[in-house]
């Protein structure tokens, strides 16, 4: 397995522990969602990553101004996404780069599922079923 | 002891079986146990479900219903060492879409 596909709960520095919640969010399009990470904030800064599929490598999340916001209050870091869209679907990870070792640690990830009908075809199919 | 990443969620239709893997790198006879956390509720302690079945520690839930929803977490322990825990997989139970009223075979239609 690739190194990014495995993790352990290390007994090393406090930086090596990062807890993420929730594991899964399903919300309708247009709603606001929040995901949280708890870590030793003194150990290093937190950034957010995103990947669309389970088997992909996570990429740095490009924060959309006015719609996506990251905040941190001591040990608690929060990512807020407003007006969620279908293209927001995927798994979000918080990541901390340790100040002293420059090692990188990730949370377990939060999967976001945006509910509703994403295409005209899906909507038509639903109407056909209703008819 | 390494735990490999597991899917964040698994969608299973009502009445089907759910299979959860617990991939880890232990070559010894590791003890694999399964636990369930009610999503968003953070009950303590998590509900103990039992041991894993095969060498991979698989958990199978047969005939899934809505009450089975939640986060399924496996713990792997070698000897007296502290356990390692998977990130957990959220089980989503899907109600199959209702069959349309006019969903009949071609033979029936032509009668």
């Amino acid at each position: 397995a690739r190194s990014e596909d495995r993790y352990r709960n290390p007994k090393g520095s406090a930086c090596s522990r990062i807890w993420q919640s929730p594991r899964f969010i399903a919300r309708k399009r247009g709603f606001t969602v929040k995901m949280h990470c708890y870590m030793n904030s003194a150990s290093g800064n937190v950034s957010w990553l995103w990947k669309q599929e389970m088997d992909e490598n996570p990429q740095q999340l490009k924060l959309e101004k006015g719609r996506m916001e990251e905040s941190q209050n001591e040990s608690l870091a929060t990512l807020t996404i407003q007006g969620i869209r279908f293209e927001d679907n995927g798994i979000y990870f918080c990541q901390q780069k340790c100040n002293n070792t420059s090692e990188v640690y990730q949370g377990c990830g939060t999967e976001l599922r945006v509910m509703g009908f994403s295409t005209l075809a899906q909507l038509k199919q639903r109407n056909t079923l209703k008819d | 002891l390494w735990m490999h990443k597991v899917p964040a969620s698994l969608m299973v239709s009502l009445g089907e079986d759910a299979h959860f893997q617990c991939p880890h790198n232990s070559s010894n006879n590791a003890n694999v146990t399964w636990w369930r956390v009610l999503h968003g509720n953070y009950t303590w302690p998590p509900e103990f479900l039992g041991p894993g079945e095969d060498p991979n520690g698989t958990l199978i839930i047969q005939n899934v219903n809505k009450s089975h929803g939640g986060i399924y977490v496996c713990r792997v322990q070698e000897g007296n060492e502290s356990y390692q825990q998977s990130c957990g997989t959220y089980l989503r139970v899907r109600q199959p879409p209702p069959r349309p009223f006019l969903d009949m075979g071609e033979g029936t239609k032509n009668r």
Partner: nanobody, 116 residues
């Protein structure tokens, strides 16, 4: 809102022990993280130890092997057993809890002084 109250602080000699407790004013909602932070004079507040809803723990390097965090579901939400105390452990210790929705609550703090 959940009101938190710490207790158990005091003056102790180097090498001694103390046990801190954190109680809630009302029955608290389900909690994701329960933690202890501390703030020494002239320094920033820092994480000491935390425990989550899975029972996993995290400790600051400086207290590993000396401090033990534990949780309870009754009125006492979280405790911190501090052994082999050192003068550098002198600080105000704060209880901190986080709900699954990310609401964060803090106690008023309890003073711990390690001095001979």
């Amino acid at each position: 809102d959940v009101q938190l109250q710490e207790s158990g602080g005091g003056l102790v000699q180097p090498g001694g022990s103390l046990s801190l407790s954190c109680a809630a004013s009302m029955s608290s909602p389900s909690l994701w993280v329960r933690a202890w932070h501390r703030q020494a004079p002239g320094k920033q507040r820092e994480l000491v130890a935390a425990i989550n809803s899975d029972g996993q723990t995290m400790y600051a390097d400086s207290v590993k092997g000396r401090f033990t965090i534990s949780r309870d579901n009754a009125k006492t939400l979280v405790s911190l057993q501090m052994d082999s105390l050192k003068p550098e452990d002198t600080a105000v210790y704060y209880c901190n809890v986080v709900t699954p929705r990310g609401q964060q609550y803090w106690g008023q703090g309890t003073q711990v002084t390690v001095s001979s």
